[in-house]
Interface confidence: medium
């Protein structure tokens, strides 16, 4: 359905508040360094223009595409060249190249300060202007997460304001706010990572990769839905994600609302779990659908082997419509196995496809593919064994100790990767233990494998910006579904030339004594990475000795009366003993 004015159409569909929020998110994701007030000004200008177009669709400029309107606003920013450098060159291009250019300049790791929640200050700001407070949240999250799923960010901003509505009345604001903000922060970070993986899937592997992922996920959630229902939703959902990943946030939010309506209109055919979602307002409804629990697997489903191994017509069915046949295999496998990770289901489908490619070219295809399900078994056993082994390690050493084991493991695999990235990734990997190892057996695999996919995607995104390791590039680019097994298979990189010893990472001052525990851990873990970069073949015993010396040194100096004096005098001794221990 074509509209004379796209901007008027979206303004009418979304309403003024959501329109403004989405425009603010879009600008903040493109211009990540601009101050909030600058963005507010741009949003106001575009909102006024949209209202003009609502009143008169044939007003000058109202027929322009949203990319043209957005891009023109971005290119008006006076400090574009000095703040963003060659991003300003995008403004010399025409659409659609101009928007592509802006997208390519999104920074996944912008140098922005860590946000520290100060309850009294935040409550004062909230009470002074709730709308501005809501906008500031959108802005701060969007600029730090330039691929955040925009309509979902609107949902979180509303939730965030709700928390302040409740807690700023409380006697102890901090006690009420901080745990809620922390819990929300975790959810927001996970949401950001999920969307980043979706966008990377589309950008690096094409929309077929995202469609396959969505087929598996939705088949697990809606196992009683038929294949055509699942593929219809997957097609619409892929369009929504393509739009959001491409910066078309107004279309994305609008289409997401339509999809939520479709799902609720057809909930009887999809899942008994949707009832609780479908009475909610649109943003909450969409969020609820995305998070909905898996419905029970229907009883009496025939065994998979009937259609996909025993049937003599498998090759005929496959060759007539490869994507549909493989899609139905993925659907049928996924709906029967809610206890499998999506990434594992995708590996099963990939290997099944490879088997058919091989077998269907043979004299007796049936004899060849009849045993395919035996061949697939190792794809389920491998992650199960890995999870068992790593959860045992986690249970033995706790989160911090497990993180340190992962730091050793991953620094040896990819010592060329920057130290902050290795620390960040290993810390995240270590948190998988806390998040997943306590879960029941039926949830352990989806929890670990799918969470690992998010973390390894973060590594791939950061590494792509400054590629330093051929092994990492290979694991990141060869196969989306096999990324985790690829990283698991990496061993010590023998091509790596060790770094000279860098004293800087063993230069400590009295400020370490007052750091929060997390930051203290990061300092120690940074030192551990640097040790390994200097001596990748250091034994676990040597590393243990050095780290124990280091902890003793910090403890001793932090207990001293003259803390800094202690660091000044004992620091060089630590450096010397470290070098001696590694000699």
């Amino acid at each position: 359905d074509t509209h004379k004015s796209e901007i008027a159409h979206r303004f009418n569909d979304l309403g003024e508040e959501n329109f403004q929020g989405l425009v603010l998110i879009a600008f903040s994701q493109y211009l990540q360094q601009c101050p909030f007030d600058e963005h507010v000004k741009l949003v106001k200008e575009l909102t006024e223009f949209a209202k003009t177009c609502v009143a008169d669709e044939s007003h000058a400029g109202c027929d322009k595409s949203l990319h043209t309107l957005f891009g023109d606003e971005l290119c008006k920013v006076a400090t574009l060249r000095e703040t963003y450098g060659d991003m300003a060159d995008c403004c010399e291009k025409q659409e659609p190249e101009r928007n592509e250019c802006f997208l390519n300049h999104k920074d996944d790791s912008p140098d922005l300060p860590k946000l520290k929640p100060e309850p009294d200050t935040l409550c004062a700001e909230f009470k002074a202007d709730e709308k501005k407070f809501w906008g500031k949240y959108l802005y701060e999250v969007a600029r730090r997460h330039p691929y955040f799923y925009a309509p979902e960010l609107l949902y979180y901003a509303n939730k965030y304001n709700g928390v302040f509505q409740e807690c700023c009345q409380a006697e102890d604001k901090g006690a009420c706010l901080l745990p809620k903000i922390d819990a929300m922060r975790e959810k927001v970070l996970a949401s950001s990572a999920r969307q980043r993986l979706r966008c990377a899937s589309i950008q690096k592997f094409g929309e077929r990769a995202l469609k396959a992922w969505s087929v598996a996920r939705l088949s697990q959630k809606f196992p009683k839905a038929d294949f055509t229902d699942v593929t219809k939703i997957v097609t619409d959902l892929t369009k929504v994600h393509k739009e959001c990943c491409h910066g078309d946030l107004l279309e994305c939010a609008d289409d997401r609302a339509d999809l939520a309506k479709y799902i609720c209109d057809h909930q009887d055919a999809l899942s008994s779990k949707l009832k609780e979602c479908c009475d909610k307002p649109v943003l909450e409804k969409s969020h609820c659908i995305a998070e909905v629990d898996k419905d029970a697997v229907p009883e009496n489903l025939p065994p998979l082997t009937a259609d996909f191994a025993e049937d003599k017509e498998v090759c005929k069915n496959y060759q007539e419509a490869k994507d549909v046949f493989l899609g139905s295999f993925l659907y049928e496998y996924s709906r029967r196995h809610p206890e499998y990770a999506v990434s594992v289901l995708l590996r099963l489908a990939k290997e099944y496809e490879a088997t058919l490619e091989d077998c269907c070219a043979k004299e007796d295809p049936h004899a060849c593919y009849a045993t395919v399900f035996d061949k697939l078994k190792h794809l389920v056993d491998e992650p199960q064994n890995l999870i068992k082994k790593n959860c045992e390690l986690f249970e033995k050493h706790g989160e911090y100790g497990f993180q340190n084991a992962l730091i050793v493991r991953y620094t040896r695999k990819a010592p060329q990767v920057s130290t902050p990235t290795l620390v960040e990734i290993s810390r995240s990997l270590g948190k998988v233990g806390t998040k997943c190892c306590a879960k029941p057996e039926s949830e352990r695999m989806p929890c670990t494998e799918d969470y690992l996919s998010l973390i390894l995607n973060r590594l791939c995104v950061l590494h792509e910006k400054t590629p330093v390791s051929e092994k990492v590039t290979k694991c990141c680019t060869e196969s989306l579904v096999n990324r985790r097994p690829c990283f698991s298979d990496l061993t010590l990189d023998e091509t790596y030339v060790p770094k000279p010893f860098d004293e800087k990472f063993f230069t400590f001052h009295a400020d370490i004594c007052t750091l929060p525990d997390t930051e203290k851990q990061i300092k120690k873990q940074t030192a551990l990475v640097e040790l390994l970069k200097h001596k990748p073949k250091a034994t676990d015993e040597q590393l243990k000795t050095v780290m124990e010396n280091f902890v003793a040194f910090v403890d001793k100096c932090c207990a001293a009366d003259d803390k800094e004096g202690c660091f000044v005098l004992e620091g060089p001794k630590l450096v010397a003993s470290t070098q001696a221990a590694l000699a």
Epitope: F501, E503, K504, F506, T507, H509, A510, D511, V568, G571, P572, K573, V575, A576, Q579
Partner: nanobody, 119 residues
Framework: EVQLLESGGGLVQPGGSLRLSCAAS????????MLWVRQAPGKGLEWVSV????????YYADSVKGRFTISRDNSKNTLYLQMNSLRAEDTAVYYC????????????WGQGTLVTVSS
Amino acid sequence: EVQLLESGGGLVQPGGSLRLSCAASGFTFDTSSMLWVRQAPGKGLEWVSVIHQSGTPTYYADSVKGRFTISRDNSKNTLYLQMNSLRAEDTAVYYCAKFPSSRMKFDYWGQGTLVTVSS
């Protein structure tokens, strides 16, 4: 090769002020923490102040806290020590040093600048 060149010392009356400078070369100054140490006549080395590579945080020995201020200009590869309310016991040769060293002594430091506080 690492070079550290201190300047700004001299004779000053008690209660007076001096500003010491240390020009650095031969290493990446902006990634190195730096410190001032001093040696009074017939005494051992005493650390005075440390500054982080970014300029903050800074640290001071109790004996100079509130009177001395350490600072740096990374664009000029220069370290400073502003000394106010000087006392006779501040008399010493002042050295700037790269912190820490790989051995149990400060192996990168300059030739020093003498500060004499006397009436």
